[in-house]
Amino acid sequence: SLLPVPYTEAASLSTGSTVTIKGRPLACFLNEPYLQVDFHTEMKEESDIVFHFQVCFGRRVVMNSREYGAWKQQVESKNMPFQDGQEFELSISVLPDKYQVMVNGQSSYTFDHRIKPEAVKMVQVWRDISLTKFNVSYLKR
Amino acid sequence: SLLPVPYTEAASLSTGSTVTIKGRPLACFLNEPYLQVDFHTEMKEESDIVFHFQVCFGRRVVMNSREYGAWKQQVESKNMPFQDGQEFELSISVLPDKYQVMVNGQSSYTFDHRIKPEAVKMVQVWRDISLTKFNVSYLKR
């Protein structure tokens, strides 16, 4: 069954945590649907964003952070492992120095930590997708 | 009650027709939600777009057409009559030479016809909004 979009969930992250998302674009790639995943510092959507991950399907991926209300330097990738009309599985793993983003089991993007992952309190998944799975797994201490 | 988004409806347009849309952005303007309205030449989403109207709330509006599968010259406006967090009413009227877009009763944007409005067969409303009303009114002959 489908999860509501935008989908918001409280989360605590640290090295070893993984966020897993399963979904499908709502439009053909010609129409450039978006997927966005934001790791927020508060439960409020206006809060700072530790890791912003935005896919313009079929075109590009941009990653960034929003600190003290201001967007910082954007990182762009033309790598496009997503398939038009197909379901995707996205997993974002917290490594000691960066986030590693896997798409359908394939390492596709990385983003160096700018703010400690422990600052994350909420994850939001939104834009032009249907969402079937959202999970945060925590490393067993 | 809410209409599904993306929302797609068959439509025939000509001079005097008006498309009316009521909705609300799904996120605060800081997060740059989008609204998109596309007038298509076929019932298929990959078809050409006679009039493409995309709002990046709080930032800008772009208008364009997609002809023989290719985007043409974009028209951009910084005019932003939409209010953060507020419901909007959008009406797109077909004039003899252009589309006139009204936001909350105020004339806000125009776009000269590149393709005859009679080529429109479908209207799609989508991206980051909740939709409460969609109506196409036809001029009484």
Epitope: - | Y68, D112, I115, K116
Partner: antibody, heavy 116, light 112 residues
């Protein structure tokens, strides 16, 4: 990119027949109306015939009505013009073309010469 | 029968500006006629330049511009170049049905 390539022209005697073809690529052929336009030597272009995207509606210039038949095969991305009872005044370069309220894209043309 | 009128010939100096017009034998050209302009050089197929009054096709230099002026459609070439010497045709859209796109007789432009 959009490409239209005509073929099937040639020299034919008055009263004879020819079948012109236009192979389309680079766009979703079945979504678009198509036209044949001809240009006689030293003259301007002249509309000959139209067919709508599904093939259900066809239109002809008075000068060719009853002699020419336009058709299309959307599965093969192909536009056809069957020309019967040809006359010397049908001598022209024949172009296939497409557009919404004009002719955005043209083929390179195929020469038809009707002469004894 | 609809007749679309154009100047048979015009000339322009290199670097100069010239305006070609496209009219109707009876009545005015309006936006609903979606005037379009084409360029043809000897031995070549016509090439679409402008459609829907003033929209340029991709790859068309911006020295070509379209408008409606008075009761006619117009094509203006600003900063004419030697390669602009050609025949120019306009079409007007006359509504749905048979022969809905009508050609003008053409203008031969000489760049002196």
């Amino acid at each position: 990119q959009v490409q239209l390539v005509e073929s099937g022209g040639g020299l034919v005697q008055p009263g004879g027949s020819l079948r012109l073809s236009c192979a389309a690529s680079g766009f979703t052929f079945g979504n678009y109306d198509m036209s044949w336009v001809r240009q006689a030597p030293g003259k301007g272009p002249e509309w000959v015939s139209d067919i709508n995207s599904g093939g259900g509606s066809t239109y002809y210039a008075d000068s060719v009505k009853g002699r020419f038949t336009i058709s299309r095969d959307n599965a093969k991305n192909s536009l056809l013009l069957q020309m019967n009872s040809l006359k010397p005044e049908d001598t022209a370069v024949y172009y296939c073309a497409t557009g919404y309220t004009g002719y955005y894209y043209w083929g390179q043309g195929t020469q038809v010469t009707v002469s004894s | 029968q609809t007749v679309v009128t154009q100047e048979p010939s015009l000339s322009v100096s290199p670097g100069g500006t010239v305006t070609l017009t496209c009219g109707l034998s009876s009545g005015s050209v309006t936006s609903s006629n979606y005037p379009a302009w084409y360029q043809q050089t000897p031995g070549q197929a016509p090439r679409a330049l402008i459609y829907s009054i003033n929209s340029r096709h991709s790859g068309v230099p911006d020295r070509f511009s379209g408008s409606i002026s008075g009761n006619k459609a117009a094509l203006t070439i600003t900063g004419a170049q030697a390669e602009d010497e050609a025949d120019y045709y306009c079409t007007l859209y006359m509504g749905t049905g048979s022969n809905n796109v009508v050609f003008g007789g053409g203008t031969h432009l000489t760049v002196l």
